[in-house]
């Protein structure tokens, strides 16, 4: 009863496409609407102003790529109002393969302001002709046996790639730099032992900056056998931090791997000194090995990727790492900390990427351990922060395909430069129910602590009711299931729980209320469940049918967001997505009436 | 029994108050100042207050069955039941199921043609004769058809590089065809040579990820009865695969966000619109298969048996068999699964409004009884041995006249149930004798109903 159905306003820009309304996000005094494309049409973002009643397409200045996936992923940071929009459809060919990852855009406060752009989980293409230079450390800190292991590693790589389109060169660096053999030498004599036979350990400093510039300008030269059409790759092998400074702008077109080995890289700070030499993301291009022994295991990661089609991979091998990650298929932001889902990572076992503030680097977090049964689980299909007043928050991530049953993993964010840790697993109970396909954290009493985790299973199949929302409450040892919500009977395929969102307090009792969308209950419906101390009311206070709002509507309730007063009338408004439209519903004013009765005679 | 009443001023309102409520139609039953609602109470209470038994109105729910002896082999009886339902009081009737011998069978073989099924395809090509022979051991009228599937032809389900769309198989495997979602190859036929010939022309294909688009294909097989050639007989759908399946929600990875509409979209025997619609959900498919009386047999490799067993919990009339790595045991598997399916009988009804509740008591031939279940269920049902289900139907309020059907899942016979309200009180005084009401009204179940402008117990 708290939302006024009669005064609903509909926004539907011309030519917006049927998926306008797939995502809705209240920002400032307007609503951002995602409109992924269909067929060959690209996706768009629209900004709808409540005052004017119009929606205008958002221009992503500086972005030269848009796929039909744009509009699928929108998130806002409740702490500072910044907006993250991702397009998980950045596809490109690499040899005979097609890679698929995401493009993300971060806006501070509004879509007109400055925009940061990043490519989370971007996999570089190493294809066709590859010219590879080994740049190896010859400083005095290397013991003779360690230096020999570096030489053995290089020989191993060259031998294994001898009948391919790879060409090699090698440069030793210390205080100065020496080309041990160039590409022409390699072409003349493809014998790694002979090519590295006369290497003399330099035993001086570690001038890494200068060495990289030397390779970029003095080794990748056509007259020395470098091929103009080849992909340039540089593998830097070092055991210590640089003893010089400067920049490596000359090497920006070279794919740069850096391998840091040994005791000098035990701290996070020392490891991070290597990041500036490597391509991004560091998670892929910086390799830290504690012993020189481990060099020989590294080769598999540097080999050319050939897609293994279904049916030809060995059970224990991962065919796909990040090539088809679909990074950015989900996203969430809290306190300036952005994460995006990457369902396709590690053979679709999935995971998520922890993005650095400038979006230029990321760290992948996935299933640990990576066993065969987690494959095709789609972890990262949903991600949602569960903020806490204490220092570290939890992140919930859904894997709705896990074993075809679905599960949700809870992770604790790193403390003081540590690592992410998986702290809880919650399993779905019905095959195909898409348990974890929607997640929502609720801070019922608005004290800064997330008390409830709502897990949607929109494809749950019941005799009369389709879809469920499972309510988990934070307890001492984690989140525990306390109850479940379901829609009205008569809709076995209604997809109750496809959208779940915490609203502002719309009934005036000081507690947060929750809206749940069921877009396939006839033309769609939205349920309101009021907050109550320690949880949610099990019965909806209101069920709004799409047809009550607008005749001919479809998929009403596919997305919902209601955290702001868009009208400036002091009443909270709720944005609801439907097929090719977005509806704004206003809440009704709440009046407290106090009745005093007296009887005479008493 | 009890009678909880609220603001009752007529016999009908009394009857609607609950199954324990009865109405006293005796004249002058109420004393001065008594409200009419005291006429509404439990039978013992009314008798105690001096209401004669034949003055107590207590309409009861009842069932009238009628047989329809037209047509041949009927496995369900009766064919028609009429129920008169008083709110809150169940009407019960019995349904008998007698499994017939040699019931006709249509079997559609739906096969995963992703690359890992290469050796399976080679064996299935040789199956036609064996498959039809196996069916003819069970029935005088068996037919077989064939279809195949791979997956949606968008990233990341298949490699969309042009060369790989032409030939998705590794090492430029020559006996390879472009990927496709579902291809209907052979309409149901009793010609085993035709099966051999047409299936013989199939080539393997390939995709990227492990799960396949089998649910897309199953939906089309269920949604396209004319194209597939289903008759109104036992419909078996053999689903052969060595891996899992995509379902609703997965399409998002390929920017396919439109829910599956459950309709037939075959053009030139291909599901060409698979890239427009998401995969069906498991529930949606279960719904569609039941609606079309199709019983799936999941022929899957050992690694996948547990997964597909969970699927059979959602799809009521379905079975799982373990497929050898090269599908060489598939005929044996189908025979076993058919025996399992045909010896288990589920009695169920179509969707009902909230106002009607149906429960089943199953009295199975092996002495097992299940009571108050949402559907009837007997296992180990033998040919020509009748089993009985007691069906109880309750209305929660005075309903509109309507009907629903009960059927044995996987069979074509139905019981039509017509439902009528039993809410009226047939009181003997419903004449238009106005004298008892001072000529200013008429008597209805012991109460004067006054003309406008008059009130009082006798419209005085």
């Amino acid at each position: 009863y708290n939302l006024d159905v009669r005064g609903a306003r509909s926004f539907s820009p011309p030519r917006a496409g049927r998926h306008f309304g797939y995502r809705v996000l209240q920002v400032g005094n307007g609503v951002i609407v995602g409109a992924p494309g269909e067929g060959n049409s690209t996706g768009s973002l629209y900004q709808c102003q409540s005052g004017t009643g119009h929606c205008l397409p958002v221009t992503l200045r500086g972005s030269n790529y848009t796929s039909k996936y744009l509009g699928m992923t929108l998130a806002t940071d409740p702490t500072d109002g910044s907006i993250l929009a991702c397009d998980p459809g950045l596809s490109r060919t690499c040899d005979q393969n097609t890679y698929l990852s995401g493009l993300c855009y971060l806006f501070r406060q509004n879509l007109q302001g400055p925009m940061l752009q990043g490519r989370p989980g971007f996999q570089e293409c190493i294809k066709g002709n590859v010219d590879l230079v080994f740049l190896f450390d010859g400083s005095m800190s290397l013991q003779p046996d360690e230096f020999q292991k570096i030489l053995d590693f290089m020989k191993d790589v060259m031998k294994k790639l001898s009948n391919t389109s790879y060409q090699f060169a090698a440069v030793q660096f210390s205080t100065s730099y020496k080309t041990e053999f160039d590409f022409s030498d390699y072409v003349k004599r493809k014998d790694p032992d002979a090519l590295l036979k006369h290497v003399k350990h330099m035993l001086l400093l570690t001038n890494t900056f200068g060495a990289i510039n030397y390779v970029a300008t003095e080794v990748f030269r056509e007259e020395l056998g470098a091929r103009p059409d080849a992909t340039k790759v540089l593998i830097i092998i070092t055991d210590g931090e640089a003893t010089d400074s400067g920049n490596i702008d000359a090497a920006k077109d070279i794919i740069r791997y850096i391998i840091g080995i040994g005791k000098h890289f035990q701290t996070k700070e020392s490891q991070e000194t290597l990041h500036k030499f490597a391509s991004k993301p560091a998670s892929e291009f910086v390799k830290i090995l504690d012993t020189f022994e481990k060099l020989k295991d590294l080769f598999t990661e540097l080999q050319k990727k050939i897609y293994v089609i279904e049916g030809t991979s060995k059970q224990d091998l991962t065919s796909f790492n990040m090539e088809l990650s679909s990074s950015g298929i989900s996203a969430d932001l809290s306190r300036g900390h952005a994460v995006v889902g990457a369902v396709g990572a590690k053979d679709w076992a999935g995971g998520f990427l922890d993005l650095k503030a400038d979006l230029q680097d990321d760290t992948f977090i996935g299933n640990e351990p990576l066993t065969p049964e987690v494959r095709a689980g789609y972890l990262g299909y949903t991600v949602t922060w569960l903020p806490s007043r204490q220092k570290t928050s939890l992140l919930a991530s859904g894997a709705p395909r896990y074993q075809h049953m679905g599960r949700v993993l809870l992770f604790q964010e790193p403390q003081g430069g540590g690592h992410w840790s998986q702290v809880q697993t919650i399993h779905g109970t019905q095959i195909g129910s898409y348990f974890g396909g929607e997640l929502c954290g609720v801070d019922v009493d608005q004290d800064g602590e997330t008390e409830l985790l709502l897990i949607g299973a929109p494809l749950f199949y019941g005799e009369q009711r389709g879809g469920r929302v499972f309510i988990y409450q934070r307890r001492q040892l984690g989140f525990e299931e306390v109850s479940e919500l379901q829609g009205d009977p008569g809709y076995p395929l209604g997809r109750f729980g496809e959208a779940i969102t915490a609203l502002t307090d719309i009934n005036g009792d000081g507690l947060v209320d929750v809206a749940v969308g069921a877009p396939l209950e006839e033309q769609g419906a939205v349920y309101i469940f009021n907050g109550r101390h320690g949880g949610l009311s099990p019965q909806p206070s209101q069920r709004i049918e799409g047809t009550q709002v607008l005749s001919g509507i479809q998929w009403f309730g596919r997305s919902i967001h209601g955290v702001k007063d868009l009208e400036g009338d002091g009443l909270a408004d709720v944005a609801v997505g439907a097929e090719s439209q977005m509806i704004v519903l206003s809440s009704r004013p709440v009046v407290d009436m106090v009745t005093l009765m007296s009887f005479s005679p008493a | 029994q009890e009678c909880t009443k609220f603001k009752v001023s007529s016999c009908r309102e009394c009857i609607e108050s609950g199954p324990g409520c009865t109405w006293c139609q005796k004249l002058n039953f109420t004393g001065p100042g008594d409200p009419d609602s005291i006429r509404c109470d439990t039978r013992p209470q009314l008798l105690m207050r001096g209401c004669a038994a034949d003055d107590i109105m207590d309409p009861t729910s009842l069932a009238e069955t009628q047989e329809d002896h037209n047509g041949g082999q009927k496995q369900l009886s009766p064919q028609k039941v009429t129920l008169y339902l008083r709110p809150g009081q169940a009407a019960a009737f019995n349904v008998t199921f007698r499994r017939a011998k040699g019931y006709p069978i249509d079997l559609y073989y739906l096969m995963d043609l992703s690359y890992s099924m290469l050796d399976d395809l080679r064996n299935v090509k040789k199956l036609g004769g064996d498959l039809l022979r196996a069916l003819n051991e069970i029935t005088e009228s068996g037919r077989i058809g064939f279809g195949s599937f791979v997956d949606k032809t968008v990233l990341p389900f298949v490699n969309t590089h042009p060369d790989k769309l032409r030939n998705p198989c590794p090492n430029k495997e020559k006996e390879c065809q472009p990927p496709f979602a579902f291809r209907h190859v052979l309409k149901l036929t009793n010609n085993s040579n035709q099966f051999q010939t047409e299936v013989g022309k199939q080539l393997i294909s390939g995709n990227l990820d492990a799960p396949e688009g089998g649910l897309d294909a199953m939906m089309q097989v269920a949604a396209c009865p004319e194209e597939i050639g289903w008759r109104n007989v036992t419909r078996l759908l053999v689903f052969a695969t060595d891996d899992g399946f995509h379902f609703a929600g997965d399409g998002k990875l390929g920017a396919i966000l439109t829910p599956n509409d459950g309709r037939c979209h075959l053009e030139d025997n291909l599901y060409k619109r698979s890239n427009e619609f998401d995969y069906p959900s498991v529930g949606q498919l279960a719904h569609k298969l039941a609606e079309n009386n199709i019983q799936p047999i999941f022929a899957v490799t050992s690694r996948m048996v547990k997964t597909y067993e969970k699927l059979t919990e959602i799809i009521p009339k379905s079975a799982v068999g373990e497929l050898s790595e090269d599908s060489s045991n598939v005929v044996h598997l189908i025979k076993n699964a058919y025996n399992k399916l045909s010896s288990r009988v589920f009695l169920d009804h179509n969707a009902l409004p909230d106002t009607l509740k149906v429960t089943y008591d199953s009295f199975c031939s092996n002495g097992v009884t299940h009571r108050n279940q949402p559907r009837g269920d007997c296992d180990g049902v033998q040919i020509n041995v009748p089993i009985t289900f007691q069906v109880k139907v309750t209305a929660t309020e005075c309903i509109q006249e309507q009907s629903f059907v009960i059927r044995a899942l996987g069979f074509t016979d139905i019981v039509t149930v017509q439902v009528l309200p039993q809410c009226e009180c047939r009181c003997r005084d419903q004449s238009r004798d106005r004298s008892l009401c001072h000529g200013k009204g008429f008597l209805e179940c012991g109460i004067c109903r006054c003309d406008t402008g008059y009130i009082g117990k006798n419209c005085e």
Partner: antibody, heavy 120, light 111 residues
Amino acid sequence: DVKLVESGGDLVKPGGSLKLSCAASGFTFSDYYMSWVRQAPGKGLELVAAIDNDGGSISYPDTVKGRFTISRDNSKNTLYLQMNSLRAEDTALYYCARQGRLRRDYFDYWGQGTLLTVSS
Amino acid sequence: DIVMTQSSNSLAVSLGERATISCRASESVDSYGNSFMHWYQQKPGQPPKLLIYRASNLESGIPDRFSGSGSGTDFTLTISSVEAEDVATYYCQQSNEDPLTFGQGTKLEIK
């Protein structure tokens, strides 16, 4: 490397019999459909017999049906053609050819052929 | 049986010129999106060699001057620029229906 070597060709009188063999190597013989194709001197190609990978399905054109029998021994990687009631028009170079793993399709590898001459 | 007819028994082309050899089937050889038509080259004293399978797929190791096209009943083998070593007899073959049948062959000669 895939290799097919035919043997057994000879001069035979009309009405006589002969058995041709084909030794296969360099591939998994039991995976493939195999065939015999003949070519009469100065003439075109004619398929005379085909067999599937496990010997369960066999096909002949009407010209040789009832007279020729194709068989295989997968343990020996060998294909055979038993020819009875030979006629002058059966005189030809007989090729053993490999077909696909899934069906009788194209012939991707051929032997060098063995010559059968039927003459009195 | 499906009868395969190659329109010309012989064809003379100058070196470097384009050669086109056609083949017609008495009924369609298309099934399920594939054309089951194949082309072979046979040089004197040698067995036939597969050039093109399923109408347009180039067999590995065959120079890309050879290409195939067509569907249904009409098919063409094209040699974009004839070389001396291409002198041979070319056969088409269908495998859509048993029995598998060959065309009578087209002999390519240099003008």
